[in-house]
Amino acid sequence: VPLSRTVRCTCISISNQPVNPRSLEKLEIIPASQFCPRVEIIATMKKKGEKRCLNPESKAIKNLLKAVSKERSKRSP
């Protein structure tokens, strides 16, 4: 991100809307760090490759994270 900045968080807006795990291309979780004091979750949707930041505090998003980690643990040997 360019320009004068206070902290290096990249999410300007966040979505609280439920996301269907099947519509997800990719889910990036960026932990809080010295650069950004909050966890950032960036969802890339299969349709058009649209990227959105998700609200880590939202119940719907917490459920999504659980569903995704369950799916991953099923796939891993």
């Epitope: 968080c9 999410c11 807006s13 979505s15 930041c53």
Partner: antibody, heavy 121, light 110 residues
């Protein structure tokens, strides 16, 4: 009703200060980044600044860096622009605008009606 | 002054098709950033017309369409109507500058 209601414009002398306000209603204000965009008479829009949904991240255009400060009060669902050391070239209609929510691709899906700031001696 | 380049004016008769071009650079369109278009009627705030290169917000007629290729983009208006007379601005995100706009194109319906 989803809207942005602006206030605080007027005539001000060069070197003086002014604060603009933008009251939001009808949407979840604390989920959206908010921008200020200005438009000089007869010219195209010029982006001024953005603030993240929680107020933690702020970015400014070079032309206002060090003079303007963007802030927000989520409890009052209001966005602010503090403008210091005003210059004649800051004369413009100032719009507040809601960020679209698209990651790293800032654009504006809701605009206020604008408030005129005239910097003149 | 404006990072994105648009023609100052275009015109067309009612019912005709007109296009408005918008030329960017490597740090905006060339870096994969989308183009967005706004319509500004006299004395009003800009209104989002096209987002993400070719998507219309609800309420925008399908006479309006957008496209982007490389460092160029365009807005097409078919079946031109008197109420389309307005200023049109392209906008993108620039990895060096943040939000950038075109200088605007005045559309005159003859």
């Amino acid at each position: 009703q989803v809207q942005l209601v602006q206030s605080g414009g007027g005539v001000v002398q060069p070197g003086r200060s002014l604060r603009l306000s933008c009251a939001a209603s009808g949407f979840t204000f604390n989920s959206y980044g908010m921008h200020w965009v200005r438009q000089a008479p007869g010219k195209g829009p010029e982006w001024v600044a953005v603030i993240s949904y929680d107020g933690n991240s702020k970015y400014y255009a070079d032309s206002v860096k060090g003079r303007f400060t963007i802030s927000r009060d989520n409890s009052k669902t209001t966005l602010y622009l503090q403008m210091n050391s005003l210059r004649s070239e800051d004369t413009a209609v100032y719009y507040c605008a809601r960020d679209s929510g698209s990651y790293l691709d800032w654009y504006f899906d809701l605009w206020g009606r604008g408030t005129l700031v005239t910097v003149s001696s | 002054q404006f990072v994105l380049t648009q023609p100052p004016s275009v015109s067309g008769a009612p019912g005709q098709r007109v296009t408005i071009s918008c030329t960017g650079s490597r740090s905006n369109f060339g870096a994969g950033h989308d183009v967005h278009w706004y319509q500004q009627l006299p004395g009003t705030a800009p209104k989002l017309l096209i987002y993400g290169n070719n998507n219309r917000p609800s309420g925008v007629p399908d006479r309006f369409s957008g496209s982007k290729s490389g460092t160029s983009a365009s807005l097409a208006i078919t079946g031109l109507q008197a109420e389309d007379e307005a200023d049109y601005y392209c906008q993108s995100y620039d990895s060096r500058l943040g939000v950038v706009f075109g200088g605007g194109t005045k559309l005159t319906v003859l």
